[in-house]
Interface confidence: low
């Protein structure tokens, strides 16, 4: 009667060849203590014999004898509430369904847990916030659906292949709800980080590379500008011509408007990347800069101090 057995455990567990799997599990048998436990691999019910067939990975019989397979497969549970399992090492051919055959004095139950064992270590997954803006602290998260007490791993953050200096906080969960390893890194990206590659690298306890995930940073930032002036020293005589050019070295997203400012005030009808000042007069001396805006906001170049001297 299924209503007499209540199980809690992760639905699917993930591991790779040579690692291990720790299966947190709790149960309740309402009619008394567990008397027999068999762990099957891919169990199939045989109607002729009214029993389950399949590879027996572990068997705990009523008289308490432990088979030699327990060295690799361990039942770490007890008679009434804990059904935690460990397989160490875990092999590719352990993939499939694990069947926990539980028998109490009067009741029997088969509980199924899925096990997914890959040939090679699977990559972690980097999670980024939906939008990243320059100088605003964000949390980068690297999540791996794996954790096992017998197989320590580490997640390392790299920026353009170099270990990131910010301290990451690594947490693990080995509970009936979830099994994972997570690394969180607080990071204040600058505009220069736009387009850079961030890697979360999975390593074993010795620092050996196992797998990785990479993302390209999309750092929203105001336009970054360079101003060039001809003549380069910005010292001219009255009647001379001056050309100032505004160059956008980076903008994310694309820029939308361009304007020029003199002494902090916008110059009317000057909305191109080149400012041509013809036959300048003394009162045109002052501090000039260009301003280019995008959806993030305006970016300003450095100021050029134009000195117009008497002819």
């Amino acid at each position: 009667d299924s209503s007499k057995w209540v199980f809690e455990h992760p639905e699917t567990l993930y591991a790779w060849e040579g690692a291990c799997v720790w299966i947190p599990c709790t149960y309740r048998a309402l009619d008394g203590d567990l008397e027999s436990f068999i762990l099957f691999h891919n169990p199939e019910y045989n109607k002729n014999t009214s029993k389950f067939d399949g590879t027996r990975l572990y068997e705990s019989t009523k008289d308490g004898k432990v088979p030699s397979e327990q060295k690799r497969v361990q039942f770490l549970g007890d008679k009434n509430k804990n059904c935690t399992l460990s397989i160490h090492p875990v092999h590719l051919n352990d993939s499939g369904q694990l069947g926990l055959r539980m028998e109490s004095k009067t009741e029997k139950w088969m509980e199924r847990i899925h096990l997914n064992v890959s040939e090679r270590p699977f990559p972690p997954h980097i999670q980024l916030p939906p939008e990243i803006q320059e100088s605003q602290e964000v949390t980068l998260t690297c999540l791996l659906n794996f954790s096992c007490y017998g197989y320590p791993i580490q997640l390392q953050w790299l920026l353009e292949g170099v270990p990131m200096r910010q301290a990451a906080v690594t947490s693990t969960s080995l509970t009936i709800k979830s099994v994972f390893t997570r690394s969180e890194l607080k990071f204040s990206p600058q505009w220069s980080h736009h387009g850079k590659i961030v890697t979360c690298q999975l390593q074993d306890a010795d620092g050996k590379f196992l797998s990785n995930d990479t993302v390209q940073l999309n750092v929203k930032h105001t336009p970054k500008l360079e101003i060039k002036v001809t003549p380069s020293d910005a010292i001219v005589r009255e009647g001379d011509s001056v050309t100032m050019t505004c160059e956008v070295s980076s903008s994310n997203p694309e820029y939308t408007t361009v304007s020029w400012l003199k002494d902090g005030t916008s110059l009317k009808k000057q909305n191109t990347f080149t400012l041509n000042l013809r036959e300048v007069t003394k009162d045109q001396s002052g501090k000039y800069c260009c301003q280019v805006s995008n959806d993030v906001g305006p970016g300003r170049s450095e100021e050029v101090f134009l000195q117009v001297q008497y002819a």
């Epitope: 580490q154 390392q156 920026l159 270990p163 200096r165 910010q166 301290a167 980080h193 620092g207």
Partner: antibody
Framework: EVQLQESGPSLVKPSQTLSLTCSVT????????WNWIRKFPGNKLEYMGY???????YYNPSLKSRISITRDTSKNQYYMQLKSVTTEDTATYYC???????????WGQGTSVTVSS | DVVMTQTPLTLSVTIGQPASISCKSS???????????LNWLLQRPGQSPKRLIY???KLDSGVPDRFTGSGSGTDFTLKISRVEAEDLGVYYC?????????FGGGTKLEIK
């Protein structure tokens, strides 16, 4: 007060493996970065590598094939092994704590190692 | 690897006089995080190295203010306004911006 103490053999034969221990008191090796640096005769310093609070490692590429840094958190010790040593590995070996992105600010007293047959 | 070049190799100074050590890196030490990881160490005779300055100009706790660090990019300087007897030893610059971290060759400060 944070203290680091290196220990290991003072004399190693060429082709052997040099094994050094750094014992840490006053701080836990599960926080910060824990480094090995060596100083050759003539004052040249070389950075060898670290083991971090999480157990991740970084090795100087010039030593990568020969060096291994491990730890035992229960003893609050970390270790450095250097394989296939030559006379060029004769140096004073220091362990040092790297607690932040700023710099190393706690060093051991250093242990002098001579490689000679 | 980033090469750190220190000059002079030896510096002989009278107590009370100023001293200056130069350190040049083969590439800029300005990190992508906006910080410049240039540090100065002093190794007094018979002692382990001790950090004096980090992030170019920040003095470590307990370091007298006669020490000042300056510079940016690839050129850095350590100055001692008035040398005292306890300042003798070997001074090293080292960079923590690029992996592997590298050290200058050292400058030996002697008292005249």
């Amino acid at each position: 007060e944070v203290q680091l103490q290196e220990s290991g053999p003072s004399l190693v034969k060429p082709s052997q493996t040099l094994s050094l221990t750094c014992s840490v008191t006053g701080d836990s090796i599960t926080s910060g970065y824990w480094n090995w640096i060596r100083k050759f005769p003539g004052n040249k310093l070389e950075y060898m590598g670290y083991i971090s609070y999480s157990g991740s490692t970084y090795y100087n590429p010039s030593l990568k094939s020969r060096i291994s840094i491990t730890r035992d958190t229960s003893k609050n010790q970390y270790y450095m092994q250097l394989k296939s040593v030559t006379t060029e590995d004769t140096a004073t070996y220091y362990c040092a704590r790297y607690p932040s992105p700023d710099a190393m600010n706690y060093w051991g007293q250093g242990t002098s190692v001579t490689v000679s047959s | 690897d980033v090469v750190m070049t220190q000059t002079p190799l030896t510096l002989s100074v009278t107590i009370g006089q100023p001293a200056s050590i130069s350190c040049k890196s083969s590439q800029s030490l300005l990190d992508s995080d906006g910080k410049t990881y240039l540090n100065w160490l002093l190794q007094r005779p018979g002692q382990s190295p001790k950090r004096l300055i980090y992030l170019v100009s920040k003095l470590d706790s307990g370091v007298p203010d006669r020490f000042t660090g300056s510079g940016s990019g690839t050129d850095f300087t350590l100055k001692i306004s008035r040398v005292e007897a306890e300042d003798l030893g070997v001074y090293y610059c080292w960079q923590g911006t690029h992996f592997p971290w590298t050290f200058g060759g050292g400058t030996k400060l002697e008292i005249k």
